[in-house]
Interface confidence: medium
């Protein structure tokens, strides 16, 4: 018979032969042969593989480093990685939760809509027209542009969401 060029789901092609993949939680020890099945072994204590695979090494479980404010949210199994979260009152800096901050800051151009609490992170909002924020802060709201008119001045440079307006003296030549 012709050697296969493609294999079924949960199989892989090696030496012109379809072998079974190892199930999640197990690693490959040896490929199948004409006479033997694929040989797989369970991952060790702190290891995992989360897919049908032909990996010869299991992946290490993620370490939730307490020095970075991390703790284990869900302990890993032979088929799943450990899930880390931050200490109570702290917030992950990314979806992968590799480190923690007490409150996330709002970037320039954004102001704080709601200061963080123990259970919710800082809520930022874009500074609307007429307001600005030139700092990265977890507390500062958007500030209104300076009103040049109330100071008997004129706008010399328009404001943006990140900068205040620049006021200057009135043109004396105007009537």
């Amino acid at each position: 018979p012709e050697p296969p060029t493609a294999c079924r789901e949960k199989q892989y092609l090696i030496n012109s032969q379809c072998c079974s993949l190892c199930q999640p939680g197990q690693k490959l020890v040896s490929d199948c042969t004409e006479f033997t099945e694929t040989e797989c072994l369970p991952c060790g204590e702190s290891e995992f593989l989360d897919t049908w695979n032909r990996e010869t090494h299991c992946h290490q479980h993620k370490y939730c480093d307490p020095n970075l404010g991390l703790r284990v949210q869900q302990k890993g199994t032979s088929e799943t990685d450990t899930i880390c979260t931050c200490e109570e009152g702290w917030h992950c800096t990314s979806e992968a939760c590799e480190s923690c901050v007490l409150h996330r800051s709002c970037s320039p151009g954004f102001g704080v809509k709601q200061i963080a609490t123990g259970v919710s992170d800082t809520i930022c909002e874009p500074c609307p027209v007429g307001f600005f924020s030139n700092v990265s802060s977890a507390f500062e709201k958007c500030h209104p542009w300076t009103s040049c008119e109330t100071k008997d001045l004129v706008v010399q440079q328009a404001g943006t969401n990140k900068t205040d307006v620049v006021c200057g003296p009135q043109d004396r030549l105007r009537a």
Partner: nanobody
Framework: EVQLLESGGGLVQPGGSLRLSCAAS????????MQWVRRAPGKGLEWVSA????????YYADSVKGRFTISRDNSKNTLYLQMNSLRAEDTAVYYC?????????WGRGTLVTVSS
């Protein structure tokens, strides 16, 4: 290297006062918001108060509003927390923190015990 050193903690009776200090070095102090956080025995970290770099804007947790006052002296690179009308539930290790930085930039803390 960023260093933060808290001091001023101690044992105080309910209703008493304490003033905590935090000496900062290794960074341009006035550029950063600073804050105080605390950890009560067996509890998580709780944010207490923060202050803007120029010292003009201050922020407080509801639990300490009206009793605690945060301030800073940028010429001395020092952050302060004046604590009045202390209660048993204020017992905690108090830490100062630089900006809203990652977990690394924290002092070792100073223990405040409120007990009769």
């Amino acid at each position: 290297e960023v260093q933060l050193l808290e001091s001023g903690g101690g044992l105080v009776q309910p209703g008493g006062s304490l003033r905590l200090s935090c000496a900062a070095s290794g960074f341009t102090f006035e550029w950063y918001e600073m804050q105080w956080v605390r950890r009560a025995p067996g509890k998580g970290l709780e944010w207490v108060s923060a202050i803007s770099g120029d010292g003009y804007r201050t922020y407080y947790a509801d639990s300490v509003k009206g009793r605690f006052t945060i301030s800073r002296d940028n010429s001395k690179n020092t952050l302060y927390l004046q604590m009045n009308s202390l209660r048993a539930e204020d017992t905690a290790v108090y830490y100062c923190a630089k900006g809203l930085e990652y977990f690394d930039y924290w002092g070792r803390g100073t223990l405040v015990t409120v007990s009769s």
